[in-house]
Interface confidence: low
């Protein structure tokens, strides 16, 4: 349905508050270095313009596309060239190339200071003084650090952020009320950002077909009672929503997401019995709830898959007539029967099935050729099952911190060229799979673990893409989206790696480590561990454990000393010497 003025249409659909918030997010995700005040000014100008178009859709420039309007506005920033360098060249291009250019310059790891949380009283004062500015600042700071954050979901986070301050700033113990809520929002926010980053990478690097396949599998697990036609419709709509958000079309994305939530709730009888509670909530909560809803129960009387996909004489006919529809149906039927499989495993099975049909349907006796196709699935299913079993046993034995350390060593040996901060961040996140998934019963472990690992390995892939240093990482990241995890799992120690020169400075510590939080202290120690492995890739587990135990004792001792700095200087030298001796450096 064409509208005379797209900007007026979206303003009316979304309302002024959401319109302004989404434009701010869009601008902050594009121009990640611009000061808050500059963005607010641009947003206010766009909003005023939108209002003139609402009043008269035929007014000058109201017929322009949102990309044209927003791009023109971004290109008015005076400091574009000195702040962003070659991104300024985007402004010489015409739409749609200009928007594509802006998208290519989004930075997954922008050089921005870490967000430091002020004292609770300071935050509450700022919140009461100017609530609107306080909340806008939250949107701005998250959006510029997470340029692919799912914009409508960020509105939901902001709503919860506001609710936390509204409640806690009048509580007797403000800190006890507020800090756990902010920690929860921070952790959930990071997880949400990483999940969305994988969706965008899937669309941008592997195309719409890959995303749709993922969506068919996931929605079929979640809504096993829904018919294939219903799942297909939801997949089409969901793909449109995520394509828009990943493409920077945040107003359209938020609008279409609201429409999809409305459709799902109006048709919940033919989708899932689990949606009732979600559908009673207000819009932002409703959309979030639907996205997280538990899997519905599987229909009781599902027939064997073999009848339609192996035994039927029409397999090749059906496949030839509508390949993607037939494969989609296979994926749907397999996924709805297997909520215990990860989505990536289901996609591997579908790929194996497709490859078999491609080969067999051209053979002299197709049925004879594909009759045993389901046997080929067995090793594909067993590989992640065994891996998860082994790693959960290791996690239960070691606990999260030491499990992370085991992964740090494992991954540093696999890809030692990757930067230390990236290895620490990714391995810490990989290690969280233990506490996140190993507590689940067998039937829920694989979807929890392997699909979470896909999200974390995508972080490695996008960070590595910015400054590629390892052919092995590039290969695992680009060859197959669904085989990334098996690809990394299969990597052995990189025998071509030339160990890093020993640098005592890397292992010099100061008294400031004593005032760090437990998490930050862990990161310091894990950074040292990665550096050790880079210096001595052939070091055994026992050698590394001995050095790390000594290091922990050294930190503990010096943090208790009266003259901490002297202790760190003197004991540090001894530790370095002892470590070099222990590792044969």
């Amino acid at each position: 349905d064409a509208h005379k003025s797209e900007v007026a249409h979206r303003f009316k659909d979304l309302g002024e508050e959401n319109f302004k918030a989404l434009v701010l997010i869009a601008f902050a995700q594009y121009l990640q270095q611009c000061p808050f005040e500059d963005h607010v000014k641009l947003v206010n100008e766009v909003t005023e313009f939108a209002k003139t178009c609402v009043a008269d859709e035929s007014a000058e420039n109201c017929d322009k596309s949102l990309h044209t309007l927003f791009g023109d506005k971004l290109c008015t920033v005076a400091t574009l060239r000195e702040t962003y360098g070659e991104m300024a060249d985007c402004c010489a291009k015409q739409e749609p190339e200009r928007n594509e250019c802006f998208l290519q310059h989004k930075d997954d790891n922008p050089n921005l200071p870490r967000l430091v949380r002020p004292e609770v009283d300071v935050m509450c004062t700022a919140f009461h003084d100017n609530e609107e500015t306080f909340l806008k600042k939250y949107l701005y700071e998250i959006a510029r650090r997470h340029p692919y954050f799912y914009a409508p979901e960020l509105l939901f986070f902001a709503k919860r952020y506001k609710a936390a301050f509204t409640e806690c700033c009048q509580a007797a113990d403000k800190a006890a009320c507020l800090l756990p809520k902010l920690d929860e929002l921070r952790d959930e926010g990071k997880a949400s950002s990483a999940k969305q980053r994988l969706k965008c990478a899937s669309l941008q690097k592997f195309g719409e077909r890959a995303f749709k396949a993922w969506a068919v599998a996931r929605l079929s697990q979640r809504f096993p009672k829904a018919e294939f036609a219903e799942v297909s419709k939801l997949v089409t709509d969901l793909t449109k929503v995520h394509t828009e958000c990943c493409h920077g079309d945040l107003l359209e994305c938020a609008d279409d997401r609201a429409d999809l939530a409305k459709y799902i709730c109006e048709n919940q009888d033919s989708i899932s019995s689990k949606l009732k509670e979600c559908c009673e909530k207000p819009l932002l909560e409703k959309s979030h709830c639907i996205a997280e809803v538990e899997n519905d129960e599987m229909p009781a009387d599902l027939p064997s898959l073999a009848a339609d996909f192996v035994e039927s004489k029409d397999v090749c006919k059906n496949y030839a007539e509508a390949k993607d529809v037939f494969l989609g149906m296979f994926l749907y039927e397999y996924a709805r029967r297997h909520p215990d499989y990860s989505v990536v495993l289901l996609l591997r099975l579908a790929k194996t099935y497709e490859t078999t049909l491609e080969k067999c349907c051209a053979a002299a006796d197709p049925h004879e050729c594909y009759a045993k196709v389901f046997d080929e699935f067995k090793p594909l299913v067993e590989e992640p099952q065994n891996l998860i079993k082994q790693n959960c046993e290791l996690f239960e034995q070691l606990g999260e911190y030491k499990f992370q350390n085991a992964l740090l060593v494992r991954y540093t040996k696999k890809v030692p060229q990757v930067s230390t901060p990236t290895l620490v961040e990714v391995s810490r996140n990989l290690g969280k799979v233990g506490s996140k998934c190993c507590k689940h019963p067998e039937a829920k472990r694989m979807p929890c673990a392997e699909d979470y690992l896909s999200v974390v390995l995508n972080q490695l892939c996008v960070l590595h893409e910015k400054t590629p240093v390892s052919d092995r990482v590039t290969k695992c990241c680009t060859e197959s989206l669904v085989n990334r995890r098996p690809c990394f799992s299969a990597l052995e120690v990189d025998e071509t790696y030339v160990p890093k020169e020993f640098n005592a400075e890397t292992f010099t510590f100061h008294a400031d480590i004593c005032t760090l939080s437990e998490k930050e202290r862990q990161i310091k120690k894990q950074t040292a561990l990665v550096e050790l492995v880079k210096h001595k890739p052939k070091a055994t587990k026992e050698q590394l454990k001995a050095v790390m135990d000594d290091f922990a004792a050294f930190v503990e001792k010096c943090c208790k000393a009266d003259d901490k700095e002297t202790c760190f200087a003197e004991e540090g030298k001894k530790l370095v010497a002892a470590s070099q001796a222990a590792l044969g450096l």
Epitope: A226, E227, F228, A229, E230, S232, K233, N267, D269, S270, D308, D314, N318, E321, A322, V325, F326, G328, M329
Partner: nanobody
Framework: DVQLVESGGGVVQAGGSLRLSCAAS????????MGWFRQAPGKERERVVS????????YYADSVKGRFTISRDNAENTVYLQMNSLKPEDTATYYC????????????????WGQGTLVTVSS
Amino acid sequence: DVQLVESGGGVVQAGGSLRLSCAASGLTFSSYAMGWFRQAPGKERERVVSISRGGGYTYYADSVKGRFTISRDNAENTVYLQMNSLKPEDTATYYCAAARYWATGSEYEFDYWGQGTLVTVSS
């Protein structure tokens, strides 16, 4: 052998109504999506409306939205097409079709076809 038998066609005045039926045999009816297509003389066959296996999802061509309604009775192995506010341009042979793997409702997804029933709308 699979059979789809259409009935209910005929001549009707513009603005009038007709109800077409399609009785299916030889297939597990509830496992198939059903559709109605039509072909006017000298024109290509076009999709009119389709309904998914359980009846929870339907597709209507823009030209018939609000006027035609598809429904199915899985117990009776029958699909119905209620046509109201008929127009002369609705004149065509109407075909019933069954699809095992139906996603978008395009013609190539349908496995079995009926012989057709003629609908003539006079002005």
